[in-house]
Amino acid sequence: FERTRSLQDPCSNCPAGTFCDNNRNQICSPCPPNSFSSAGGQRTCDICRQCKGVFRTRKECSSTSNAECDCTPGFHCLGAGCSMCEQDCKQGQELTKKGCKDCCFGTFNDQKRGICRPWTNCSLDGKSVLVNGTKERDVVCGPSPADLSPGASSVTPPAPAREPGHSPQ
């Protein structure tokens, strides 16, 4: 099939990083600067994305792959392919229309992005609060009060709070 295809269409032999140049008898020509072709058999090369303004270059454009952008420091990506940059806040805050605001009592945010979420309600699982929540950290639930009989050995300390999550960009 490949052989038949190439007999019928000489452009199918042009690899990624080149284009089939109609102006030169369908010779495979390299993509010009600032352009790329990520698949073979292309009749044109696509222009590279520019990472300007609030965007910065995460991966340079090559002859076979487009540039990839992320956001300048203090911002994080939103949308497909990092199509918008949103301001970071501190842990313990969320971004509102008025800027970064501290989480209300009873909520927390352990990341620089996203919204404040309510503390876990330990009693729903029949447990007690072992470590109080803060604006930056959820509560840590321990065994139920009934499990803590008088004179029982001390409770094993909780594992350290997890590091802030980082969403893939």
Partner: antibody
């Protein structure tokens, strides 16, 4: 809420310099890029250019170097100057915040160039 | 520069009906496209970014699709407040460019 408020002279004669300022209220000023866009009466939108808090700029080549941007971070303001105006520069001029797309816009200022 | 072409120039639709607006880029822009709504005497308002992500506070009846060179904005059931002019804009490459707009009017 982030608000952009703009002002400047609304009536100019040919060859004069257009001057507009945009103030940003609420939210952060530094880190963002701040843009100017114009819209001739009854027509579409044209990007003029942009500036950030540290004064880094980019502009539309179609304006052939007639445009100057400036920023005053102490007041959270940025400005546009367009020199040697002609009737073709008559438009509503908007300031906007650039986060990739333009997510917040000023109210617009109609600038008329007439002799 | 990247040229953005919108069609149709005017779209006549009855309230409650579906509206489909098209935007074509002169070269591939991946999904780095925004849609705006503009009402008379007002500044444009961001509806969609990244070709398909609704901006904060935008009703679910607005949806965007497409990638490469062909893009669509769909308003599933037109409300009276949706009659306006809609613009697409690419921010894949500088200078930033807008389409000529599609006016959605009452049929």
């Amino acid at each position: 809420q982030v608000q952009l408020q703009q002002w400047g002279a609304g009536l100019l004669k040919p060859s004069e310099t257009l001057s507009l300022t945009c103030a940003v209220y609420g939210g952060s000023f530094s880190g963002y890029y701040w843009s100017w866009i114009r819209q001739p009466p009854g027509k579409g939108l044209e990007w003029i250019g942009e500036i950030n808090h540290s004064g880094s700029t980019d502009s539309n080549p179609s304006l052939k170097g007639r445009v100057t941007f400036s920023v005053d971070t102490s007041k959270n303001q940025f400005s546009l100057k367009l020199n040697s105006v002609t009737a073709a520069d008559t438009a509503v001029y908007y300031c906007a915040r650039l986060t990739g797309p333009f997510d917040y816009w000023g109210q617009g200022t109609l600038v008329t160039v007439s002799s | 520069e990247f040229v953005m072409t919108q069609s149709p120039a005017t779209l006549s639709v009855s309230p409650g009906e579906r509206a489909t607006l098209s935007c074509r880029a002169s070269q591939s822009i991946s999904s780095i496209l925004a849609w705006y709504q503009q009402k008379p005497g007002q500044a444009p308002r961001l509806l969609i970014y990244g070709a398909s992500t609704r901006a904060t506070g935008i009703p679910a009846r607005f949806s965007g699709s497409g990638s490469g060179t062909e893009f669509t904005l769909t308003i599933s059931s037109l409300q009276s407040e949706d009659f306006a002019v809609y613009y697409c804009q690419q921010y894949y490459n500088w200078p930033l460019t807008f389409g000529g707009g599609t006016k959605v009017e009452i049929k």
